[in-house]
Interface confidence: low
């Protein structure tokens, strides 16, 4: 147990933050988006789907140091976190053909990033060892999705591995470990 | 999914103590950094404490430096606030935050979060 920075398969590494993101005001509705007697969702009501420029969906800079073992980058990387609840910034009645309750079945958006960026970092080593280079995907911007079941399942459901995407003139790279997996290896840290 | 639960608020007199502390639990492995934010009754929510989950790097706001300390359990995974010499204005509901961000070396990553929990009212009177 516990969140002691570790590596948790060969290329994703989970660093220490450099700085911290400072989340902005939340909505009127200080309701959580994560507890547990809303399955991950917004409290229910009913809302209109449709017009996703309504919803709330936060970018976040964060700045930090990426880490590959011993070695850390020379210069901390921007990044952006995608924060908030995506759903209206006004209620809308349930008139009868337009409102919709929020229920698992229906409609479901979050805030998840939109558009990535490269960035090529130089990772320093301790004992005298040449500098290494890598190249990170940073998030580059934030939306509001309808969440499809490629997004529930490679990006929303497992924190803990990294969500297995085909690349193109690439073989698809085998999915990393499960998180409960992840979970026993942080256990087993301690 | 990241469970926050917060405990530890109350009414206390100015120049008193408290100690808030917040649980977190789910994908705590994702957590990079937890902090305590404060709303008072008409303003904004603001932030009072960082800390980072493995290293321990803290931060806090101007107001509370020198009287607030924040501390983690990684054993517990907790995060706590001790406040100290509290004062009328700091007064306010105290919020639980964490903070996930994916990835580093390498292509595949997963979104990005911030996850509050429910709450606690913390009342310093004079």
């Known amino acids: 147990q516990g969140w002691q920075a570790f590596k948790n398969d060969a290329t994703e590494i989970i660093p220490e933050l450099g700085e911290y993101p400072e989340p902005p005001p939340e909505l009127e509705n200080n309701k959580t988006m994560n507890r547990a007697e809303n399955g991950g969702r917004p409290p229910h009501h009913p809302f209109e789907t449709k017009d996703v420029s309504e919803y709330s969906c936060r970018e976040l800079h964060f700045t930090r140091y990426v880490t590959d073992g011993p070695c850390r980058s020379a210069k901390p990387v921007t990044e952006l976190v995608c924060s908030g609840q995506c759903g209206p910034a006004r209620l809308l009645p349930n008139a009868i053909g337009r409102g919709k309750w929020w229920r698992p079945s229906g409609p479901d958006f979050r805030c998840i990033p939109d558009r990535y960026r490269a960035q090529r970092v130089q990772l320093l080593c301790p004992g005298g060892e040449a500098p290494r280079a890598r190249k990170v995907r940073l998030v580059a911007s934030c939306k509001c999705k309808r969440l499809t079941r490629f997004h529930n399942q490679s990006e929303l459901k497992d924190f803990g591995t990294e969500a297995a995407r085909p690349q193109k003139g690439r073989k698809p790279r085998p999915r990393a470990r499960s998180a409960k997996a992840n979970q026993a290896e942080l256990e087993n840290a301690y | 999914e990241v469970q926050l639960v917060e405990s530890g608020g109350g009414l206390v007199q100015a120049g008193g103590s408290l100690r808030l502390s917040c649980a977190a639990s789910?994908?705590?492995?994702?957590?990079?950094?937890m902090g305590w934010y404060r709303q008072a009754p008409g303003r904004q929510r603001e932030m009072v404490a960082t800390?980072?989950?493995?290293?321990?790097?803290?931060n806090y706001t101007d107001s509370v430096k020198g009287r607030f300390s924040i501390s983690r359990d990684n054993n517990k995974n907790t995060v706590y606030l001790q406040m100290n010499s509290l004062k009328p204005e700091d007064t306010a509901v105290y919020y639980c935050?964490?903070?996930?961000?994916?990835?580093?070396?390498?292509?595949?990553?997963?979104?990005?979060?911030?996850?509050w929990g429910q709450g606690t009212q913390v009342t310093v009177s004079s």
């Open positions: 800390i980072t989950t493995s290293g321990g790097l803290t």
């Open positions: 789910g994908s705590i492995f994702s957590i990079l950094t």
């Open positions: 935050n964490a903070a996930m961000v994916g990835g580093g070396v390498g292509l595949g990553r997963r979104p990005s979060f911030s996850y």
